[in-house]
Interface confidence: low
């Protein structure tokens, strides 16, 4: 159950309501838990998790990644620039999360939960952002053709793509989690 839809919250009205920051923190950790479960199935199914990071880096996926200029690192931290990067990055990840939807057998519901929870997280963060104009939304047509291309890959490349998406998304969320705690 995603945070905010927790039945325990209904049963305990005396509990202090979560602040906006706490909700975001909880939401990210919920998604990370989901990614962990998906990674488990992926690693059990293929040997991708054993591949070296260097070997995996040789791919043509344009997955969002934090860079120094994004203002999310300890050195050169910039709250506004960083928040824009987090939201933009999550919006860019959405097409890859859509791709993951048919990639799991035993964790199909978990894949859907990660996708839906990410949409909720984006909404939380957009409320927090002051400079919404700086956030660029990916082009739907470009996303549709990317999705078609990814789905047309052979089995080995699809396994590789699944693994890379999960690892990169975990990395992006983990960086975001800590950066958001400074805001």
């Amino acid at each position: 159950v995603p945070p905010g839809e927790d039945s325990k919250d209904v049963a305990a009205p005396h509990r202090q309501p979560l602040t906006s920051s706490e909700r975001i923190d909880k939401q990210i950790r919920y998604i990370l838990d989901g990614i962990s479960a998906l990674r488990k199935e992926t690693c059990n199914k293929s040997n991708m998790c054993e591949s070296s990071k260097e070997a995996l880096a040789e791919n043509n996926l344009n997955l969002p990644k934090m860079a120094e200029k994004d203002g999310c690192f300890q050195s050169g931290f910039n709250e506004e620039t960083c928040l824009v990067k987090i939201i933009t990055g999550l919006l860019e990840f959405e097409v890859y999360l859509e791709y993951l939807q048919n990639r799991f057998e035993s964790s199909e519901e978990q894949a859907r939960a990660v996708q839906m929870s990410t949409k909720v997280l984006i909404q939380f963060l957009q409320k927090k952002a002051k400079n919404l104009d700086a956030i660029t939304t990916p082009d739907p047509t470009t996303n549709a053709s990317l999705l078609t291309k990814l789905q047309a890959q052979n089995q080995w490349l699809q396994d590789m793509t699944t693994h890379l998406i999960l690892r990169s998304f975990k990395e992006f969320l983990q960086s975001s989690l800590r950066a958001l705690r400074q805001m």
């Epitope: 990370l32 690192f73 931290f77 800590r178 705690r181």
Partner: antibody
Framework: EVQLVESGGGLVQPGGSLRLSCAAS????????MSWVRQAPGKGLEWVSA????????SYADSVKGRFTISRDNAKNTLYLQMNSLKPEDTAVYYC???????????????WGQGTQVTVSS | QSVVTQPSALSVTLGQTAKITCQGG??????AHWYQQKPGQAPVLVIY???SRPSGIPERFSGSSSGGRATLTISGAQAEDEGDYYC???????????FGGGTHLTVLG
């Protein structure tokens, strides 16, 4: 070359106080979170305390909360650990550790000092 | 406080592969980092963020993580790899580091 040099350790009686220092060089000290990690004789590593880059946010292990205070002087490139009400179980080698900059991800330490010995005994 | 569990000791024959595991609920949403410590020396970071290797660390060291379980793999263990290995994660707040109890690796032969 990154260097972290701890000092201020020694023998102290239970209930006494000590102030540890860690002199940092070879990196922009004011840009990085820092921690103290200790190791009791023959035991494993135990995280003690952390402080963010600016010094405005600190956190402590339950075992030292209320007795130890972490601080930093970015102008002097120095990290401190004020230890009060010391107990025999605080006996350990105390390491100063620099947090790696891989974004704001959960703490990871890419450089460690050689440690300073603190012995609490009567 | 989160708990991270790892075996207390492991033996490997020279040139063989050593796998040290680390388990804990916190590893689901936090990264695993690995440190090597030799007697009388400070710990040295050998793997960070589950599977990244700092510069200067030999390629035989690699890491992986899934489902709350992290693994440090030393492919072709050398005599100089003998020592204590610590897994480190973070507590639920993300501010406090949590260390495993350490695994003493012995390289035989």
């Amino acid at each position: 070359e990154v260097q972290l040099v701890e000092s201020g350790g020694g023998l102290v009686q239970p209930g006494g106080s000590l102030r540890l220092s860690c002199a940092a060089s070879g990196f922009t000290f004011s840009s990085y979170a820092m921690s103290w990690v200790r190791q009791a004789p023959g035991k494993g590593l135990e995280w003690v305390s952390a402080i963010n880059s600016g010094g405005g946010s600190t956190s402590y292990a339950d075992s030292v909360k209320g007795r130890f205070t972490i601080s930093r002087d970015n102008a002097k490139n120095t990290l401190y650990l004020q230890m009060n009400s010391l107990k025999p179980e605080d006996t350990a080698v105390y390491y100063c550790a620099k947090e790696g900059d891989t974004g704001w991800k959960d703490p990871m330490y890419d450089y460690w000092g050689q440690g300073t010995q603190v012995t609490v005994s009567s | 406080q989160s708990v991270v569990t790892q075996p207390s000791a492991l033996s490997v024959t020279l040139g063989q592969t050593a796998k040290i595991t680390c388990q804990g609920g916190g590893l689901r949403s936090s990264y695993a980092h690995w440190y090597q410590q030799k007697p009388g020396q400070a710990p040295v970071l050998v793997i960070y963020d589950d599977d990244s290797r700092p510069s200067g660390i030999p390629e035989r060291f690699s890491g992986s993580s899934s489902g709350g379980r992290a693994t440090l793999t030393i492919s072709g263990a050398q005599a100089e790899d003998e020592g204590d290995y610590y897994c480190q994660s973070a507590d639920s707040s993300g501010n406090a580091a949590v260390f495993g109890g350490g695994t003493h690796l012995t390289v035989l032969g």
